[in-house]
């Protein structure tokens, strides 16, 4: 089976790398525009220059292209706690990230929110907080992990998963009480 190519890929595949086929004349291969620029006018003929113009402020192209317009720079999302790591340039989009001691949680492929790294109070750090993953905590005896926080076993209800984790502790307490009565 021959893989299906889109119109643009079909047109580009006829020309050598770094060139694209003229949209009005498929016998002409024009040189692509460098990153940071966009296509203003196709080359008039073989061996002649493509008219590329630099992207305007607030726009960019990150690779060689024959785009008629530059891409709009991304904005960091304040409502998601994002901060600007590096600003947009003509050849690179804005880079957004999180503050120190925060991690990114991706709600979808291109949407992340910044959250504070867990401190593992009443527990110990099993795995340190990373750029895209919260701290992994291990809880001290008498505590269980709920939504990445160590919660006292006194808050453990019978119906919850924590009963397995808290049961030895509860039995321990009962055992101590029993031994004290004899």
């Amino acid at each position: 089976l021959v893989p299906h190519l889109g119109d643009r890929e079909k047109r580009d595949s006829v020309c050598p790398q770094g060139k694209y086929i003229h949209p009005q004349n498929n016998s002409i291969c024009c040189t692509k525009c460098h990153k940071g620029t966009y296509l203003y006018n196709d080359c008039p003929g073989p061996g002649q220059d493509t008219d590329c113009r630099e992207c305007e402020s607030g726009s960019f192209t990150a690779s060689e292209n024959h785009l008629r317009h530059c891409l709009s720079c991304s904005k960091c999302r304040k409502e998601m706690g994002q901060v600007e790591i590096s600003s947009c340039t003509v050849d690179r989009d804005t880079v957004c990230g999180c503050r120190k001691n925060q991690y990114r949680h991706y709600w979808s492929e291109n949407l992340f929110q910044c959250f504070n790294c867990s401190l593992c109070l009443n527990g110990t750090v099993h795995l340190s907080c990373q750029e895209k993953q919260n701290t992994v905590c291990t809880c001290h005896a008498g505590f269980f992990l709920r939504e990445n926080e160590c919660v006292s076993c006194s808050n453990c209800k019978k119906s919850l998963e924590c009963t397995k984790l808290c049961l030895p502790q509860i039995e321990n307490v009962k055992g101590t009480e029993d031994s004290g009565t004899t």
Epitope: R77, K78, E79, M80, H105, W107, Q113, F115, N116, N134, E147, N148
Partner: nanobody, 119 residues
């Protein structure tokens, strides 16, 4: 007590429109960015759209961009989702929620409103 009541769902033909509403109470609505998420049959939760506190900054998933519009009326404590050019793949239960703050989980939910797109 936080309450979120979604409404406006229903059966609609492909290409049709619906307007979902979410009436909020029990918290200071105007202080919270708000989110629409959806759950298609047999699928996980998908982010649809969100809006900042004042209604200026919005975000849309690629799959709904140009077709859906999120808005809010802080005087009425209500969030909206205008859905146009509906497709079969938009069929889902739609939920509204305040944007999570402490961690990647939704602490408050409504009961959701079912949107079915079918001919």
């Amino acid at each position: 007590e936080v309450q979120l009541l979604e409404s406006g769902g229903g059966l609609v033909q492909p290409g049709g429109s619906l307007r979902l509403s979410c009436a909020a109470s029990g918290f200071t609505f105007a202080h919270e960015p708000m989110v629409w998420v959806r759950q298609a049959p047999g699928k996980g939760l998908g982010w649809v759209s969100h809006i900042d506190r004042v209604g200026q900054d919005t975000y849309y998933a690629d799959s709904v961009k140009g077709r859906f519009t999120i808005s809010r009326d802080n005087s009425k404590n209500t969030l909206y989702l205008q859905m146009n050019s509906l497709r079969a793949e938009d069929t889902a239960v739609y939920y509204c929620a305040p944007l999570p703050k402490r961690g990647p989980r939704f602490d408050y939910w409504g009961q959701g409103t079912l949107v079915t797109v079918s001919s």
